[in-house]
Every structure is written in C-alpha cells, then in structure tokens.
C-alpha cells in the first residue's frame, strides 16, 4: 500500500469519515504510520 504522507492523510480521512469521527484524539496523520492501516 502507498505510504507517502499524502496517501496516509487521505486514508485517515476516509477512516474518520466511515467511523463518524469517533476515533482517538491523537489519531491524526502525523501521528499515524502507514502500518496502522
């Protein structure tokens, strides 16, 4: 899977959208490595 910063950001945005935003406060692009997906 793509692990550039931009890919990570878009993947996280999709995850947040699907979860209704119900995720931990520190679940942000700069804290989340690609392996978290």
């Amino acid at each position: 899977a793509c692990d550039t910063a931009t890919c990570v950001t878009h993947r996280l945005a999709g995850l947040l959208s699907r979860s209704g935003g119900v995720v931990k406060n520190n679940f942000v692009p700069t804290n989340v490595g690609s392996k978290a997906f």
């Epitope: 931009t6 890919c7 950001t9 692009p29 700069t30």
Partner: antibody
Framework: EVQLVQSGAEVKKPGASVKVSCKAS????????MNWVRQAPGQRLEWIGD????????NYNQKFKGRATLTVDKSASTAYMELSSLRSEDTAVYYC????????????WGQGTTVTVSS | DIQMTQSPSSLSASVGDRVTITCKAS??????VAWFQQKPGKSPKALIY???YRYSGVPSRFSGSGSGTDFTLTISSLQPEDFATYYC?????????FGGGTKVEIK
C-alpha cells in the same frame, strides 16, 4: 478559517540562500504534513519536499537534497523552506501546501512567495 | 521519478462544452492522483483526490476517473470561470510529480 500565509517576495544573488516562511492558522499545525512546491515561470509545478511538523521528519525530492532544508517552529505554527546555493534557475514562485482533515477536508495552499535570483 | 504526461497541452473550447483532459503515468500509481486548477498569478486550487473524489465545494461538473497509469479529468459543461490551466499530480511515490499542464482557453 484555515490559512497559510507566506512571507514576501525576495531578490537574491547567485550563490546566496533564501528562507521562506509559511504561517498556519485555523487548524492544529502539528497534525498535518506540510508540502513545499515551486513553479518557475511558464513551467510545471515541482515538489520540493514535505515535513511532519510533529516530529520534524522530512522527505525531499532528490533534486533538492542538500540544497533545500525544511524546518518548523511549532510554537509559532510556522514552516520554513530554506534553499541554498541559489542559481538563476531557482527563480520561481514557492508555495507551501497542506491537506487538512479537520475542520475542513481540503488541500490548502499558501499565496506563494516569488524568489528572484539575479546578479 | 514517475513521469506524468498530460494531453493536450492546450485546448480551445466554448462555454457549455464538455472537456476531457488526460494524464498518463510512466508506471502504476494505483488511484493516487490529484487534479488542480490554476489561474494566472494565483495558487493552484485542489479539485480531485484519489483519482475520482471531489473536494468539498468543488462543483459537480468536475469529475475524475482512472487507475493504474491512465487518468482523466472531465468538465461536463464548461463555465466562464473554468478557463484556466489544469495539472495532474501523482502522490503514490516520492518524489511527487506533476503533469505539464493543460491550458483551457476560450474559443
């Protein structure tokens, strides 16, 4: 309102260095990567690199590695791009850009900083 | 580096026309492609990410498609404010790279 406000135009001599700033507001600066892109007159956009403001970690376009340095001042929510050993081909508009998720999912760009390299 | 080749480099069209711009990557970039609009003297404005998703606030007449190496930006009915230069970008691999741009001019 998310804003990326860049420093003003610069005129430099060949061999000199320039440092462009990008002040972020309206979102949590350390949550999102900051990209730097340039555009020479009449040319395509060219990616310089990105920085993780949370850790200071960077990725550089090899073309600029060794000449470009990306840094941040977290307390001032400001990102910096320094380019050294300037040559005439570095004359361009330099942009900072960041993809933000909260409060609005969008790819925000600064207004651009014109850097002119001329003897 | 991945080369992004855009075509055409320029086109003339009228208000109401359907406009299609293509972008070809030199290797597979999955769907990790964005499209930008730029007007003279202005910063690029993001339109599309992940090949086919519109950012909030982008009019529905803009649509993107493609995966792998071939991508398309379509403007279904060209409006006066759409005359600009359009760029594709791949962000699948470092360094991110942009296409050469397509200038959409008034016929």
């Amino acid at each position: 309102e998310v804003q990326l406000v860049q420093s003003g135009a610069e005129v430099k001599k060949p061999g000199a260095s320039v440092k462009v700033s990008c002040k972020a507001s309206g979102y949590t600066f350390t949550d999102y990567y900051m990209n730097w892109v340039r555009q020479a007159p009449g040319q395509r956009l060219e990616w310089i690199g990105d920085i993780n403001p949370n850790t200071g970690g960077t990725n550089y376009n090899q073309k600029f590695k060794g000449r470009a340095t990306l840094t941040v001042d977290k307390s001032a929510s400001t990102a910096y791009m320094e380019l050294s050993s300037l040559r005439s081909e570095d004359t361009a508009v330099y942009y900072c850009a960041s993809i933000i998720i909260v409060p609005n999912y969008f790819d925000y760009w600064g207004q651009g900083t014109t850097v002119t390299v001329s003897s | 580096d991945i080369q992004m080749t855009q075509s055409p480099s320029s086109l003339s069209a009228s208000v109401g026309d359907r406009v299609t711009i293509t972008c070809k990557a030199s290797q597979n970039v999955d769907t990790n492609v964005a499209w930008f609009q730029q007007k003279p003297g202005k910063s690029p404005k993001a339109l599309i990410y992940s090949a086919s998703y519109r950012y909030s606030g982008v009019p529905s007449r803009f649509s993107g498609s493609g995966s792998g190496t071939d991508f398309t930006l379509t403007i279904s009915s060209l409006q006066p404010e759409d005359f600009a230069t359009y760029y594709c970008q791949q962000y699948n691999n470092y360094p991110y790279t942009f296409g050469g741009g397509t200038k959409v001019e008034i016929k």
